[in-house]
């Protein structure tokens, strides 16, 4: 018996010594009963009895993916030859957190790479990291079920003032990075244009120094600095930002010509290239992807294309000469 037409060499599976033609002949009514699929899995070609040499494919339910070798083979003794296969969750389940914490965005399942933000009622901050990312089937960093809210010293200090400021009598003055920032505040990845270096800084210290007119400090992203796309884009964005006509304060960040400020998350979100304004003075001559032709784009279009991580080479500022 062969499950494939024999038009040449009988196939040998990886790590399998026996050829199909070497399998002993069997009675038609013998074979293997339906195997038990792994948890959250099912058998694709389901039936009551399988012939010797026949393979079944293990598939996983939506939200899960197969890890390991997903084929079982029916052996002459009526058992199944099966490797280690399991259905691993490819999405993260909404974490269970204390009632006082709000999860944004609020969904039942989150795809790999999606992040959630935990927030507290006004005047309180999360006593630990506030941003978590779905990686595989778990959250990074792990979410402690004892995570709660604590009184926000930043809010208490600032009163009705801007971030990085505090109330002093009837006026607002800059916080002192040394004196006013001894309490816990979340980590930010920050770029210093003077030293041309990036580093992790507590939010309070960053805001206080920015308030003291340290214009060379630029917010890159929430959380400690880690190599990767987020950091790359943060650095490139900082370089482009010096020519932006729009500089709109947005939480820790500043939004530029190619961005909108998301009020609910206090984050800058990049537009799509077709959503950009037309014209403008800040123009660049670029080469797109693998194209050899040059194209003049404005700063908004350049920002959106780079934000979307599309290939583009900036040849020089200003219009293309040709």
């Amino acid at each position: 018996f062969s499950i494939m037409e024999n038009n040449g060499q009988p196939c040998i599976n990886d790590d399998e010594e026996m050829k199909e033609v070497d399998l002993p002949e069997i009675e038609a009514d013998s074979g293997c009963p339906q195997p038990v699929p792994p948890e959250n899995g099912f058998i694709r070609n389901e039936k009551q009895l399988y012939l010797v040499g026949e393979d079944v494919e293990i598939s996983c339910l939506t939200g899960f993916e197969t890890v390991g070798y997903q084929y079982f083979r029916c052996l002459p003794d009526g058992t199944w030859r099966q490797g280690d296969v399991e259905c691993q969750r490819t999405e993260c389940i909404k974490p269970v957190v204390q009632e006082v914490l709000t999860i944004t965005p609020f969904q039942r399942l989150y795809r790999i790479g999606e992040s959630i933000e935990l927030t507290c009622p006004k005047g309180f901050v999360v006593a630990g990291p506030s941003r978590y990312t779905c990686q595989g089937n778990s959250w990074t960093p792990p979410i402690s079920n004892s995570l709660t809210c604590e009184k926000d010293t930043l809010t208490k200090l600032k009163g009705h003032c801007q971030l990085g400021q505090k109330q002093s009598g009837s006026e607002c003055i800059c916080m002192s990075p040394e004196e006013d920032c001894s309490h816990h505040s979340e980590d930010l990845c920050v770029f210093d244009t003077d030293s041309n270096d990036y580093f992790t800084s507590p939010a309070c210290k960053f805001l206080a120094e920015k308030c003291l007119n340290n214009q060379q400090l630029h917010f890159l992203h929430i959380g400690s600095c880690q190599d990767g796309r987020q950091l790359e884009w943060g650095l490139e964005r900082t370089r482009l930002s010096s020519n932006s006509t729009k500089k709109e304060s947005c939480g820790y960040d500043t939004c530029y010509d190619w961005e909108k400020c998301s009020a609910s998350t206090s984050k800058c979100v990049c537009l799509l290239p077709p959503q950009c304004f037309k014209g403008g003075n800040q123009l660049y001559c670029v080469k797109m992807g693998s194209s050899t032709s040059e194209k003049t784009l404005n700063i908004c279009e350049v920002g959106t294309i780079r934000c979307a991580n599309r290939k583009m080479e900036i040849l020089h500022p200003g219009k293309c000469l040709a």
Epitope: A263, S264, T265, K267, C270, L272, P274
Partner: antibody, heavy 123, light 106 residues
Framework: QVQLVQSGAEVKKPGESLKISCKAS????????INWVRQMPGKGLEWMGQ????????NYNPSFQGQVTISADKSISTAYLQWSSLKASDTAMYYC????????????????WGTGTTVTVSS | EIVLTQSPATLSLSPGERATLSCRAS?????LHWYQQKPGQSPRLWIY???KRATGIPARFSGSGSGTDYTLTISSLEPEDFAVYYC?????????FGQGTKLEIK
């Protein structure tokens, strides 16, 4: 859950004005672009334009520019599509749809669609 | 504007068969997105960024392609898959949809 609920069916005469609505719930209305899409009877989908309720920024399909006005009232999480003078050719189903964002960039597609509003213009 | 041409206009197949829907762009697009629409219902996001299935979409659906040629494939049709499918681009203004492919039961 995230929902876009549109106003009921409308029957109008040519030359009349009309404003249809799209009420959002379950998400931060100000932070997402709302788009309007037309579907004429038995036909395909046509993008009309969009609004960003956070700052009332709009983008229109040149084919619809000047024909309709898109607006929003973020205090009641509602977007609007309006005509000052309807024509028989405006007879169609109109959908509002949300353009989401993922990570730190908006996306090119619509992840949530409204219930649809049928507009009939006939003398 | 970028014109998206879907073919065939109508595809008549039986449950269990494989369906291949095509969408051709008049000029190169970065990504293509697909929606499903059933009679009397609103469209629903089906495949985004060329090949990613939207939440809850079965694994029998897959998307592929690049440049100007894109495909939506259904490996083995189920009765609930019969509907109209639209492709969509927004690489350049205005955002455009294909005219749709009606997938009907043979």
């Amino acid at each position: 859950q995230v929902q876009l609920v549109q106003s009921g069916a409308e029957v109008k005469k040519p030359g009349e004005s009309l404003k249809i609505s799209c009420k959002a719930s379950g998400y931060a209305f100000s932070d997402y672009w709302i788009n309007w899409v037309r579907q004429m009877p038995g036909k395909g989908l046509e993008w009309m334009g969009q609004i960003y309720p956070g700052d009332d920024d709009t983008n229109y399909n040149p084919s619809f520019q000047g024909q309709v006005t898109i607006s929003a009232d973020k205090s009641i999480s509602t977007a609007y599509l309006q005509w000052s003078s309807l024509k028989a050719s405006d007879t169609a189903m109109y959908y509002c749809a949300r353009e989401g964002y993922y990570g730190y960039t908006y996306v090119e597609y619509f992840d949530v669609w409204g219930t649809g509003t049928t507009v009939t213009v006939s003398s | 504007e970028i014109v998206l041409t879907q073919s065939p206009a109508t595809l008549s197949l039986s449950p269990g068969e494989r369906a291949t829907l095509s969408c051709r762009a008049s000029s190169s697009v970065s990504y293509l997105h697909w929606y499903q629409q059933k009679p009397g219902q609103s469209p629903r996001l089906w495949i985004y960024d060329t090949s990613k299935r939207a939440t809850g979409i079965p694994a029998r659906f897959s998307g592929s392609g690049s440049g100007t040629d894109y495909t939506l494939t259904i490996s083995s049709l189920e009765p609930e898959d019969f509907a109209v499918y639209y492709c969509q681009q927004w690489t350049s203004n205005p955002l455009t949809f294909g005219q749709g492919t009606k997938l009907e039961i043979k």
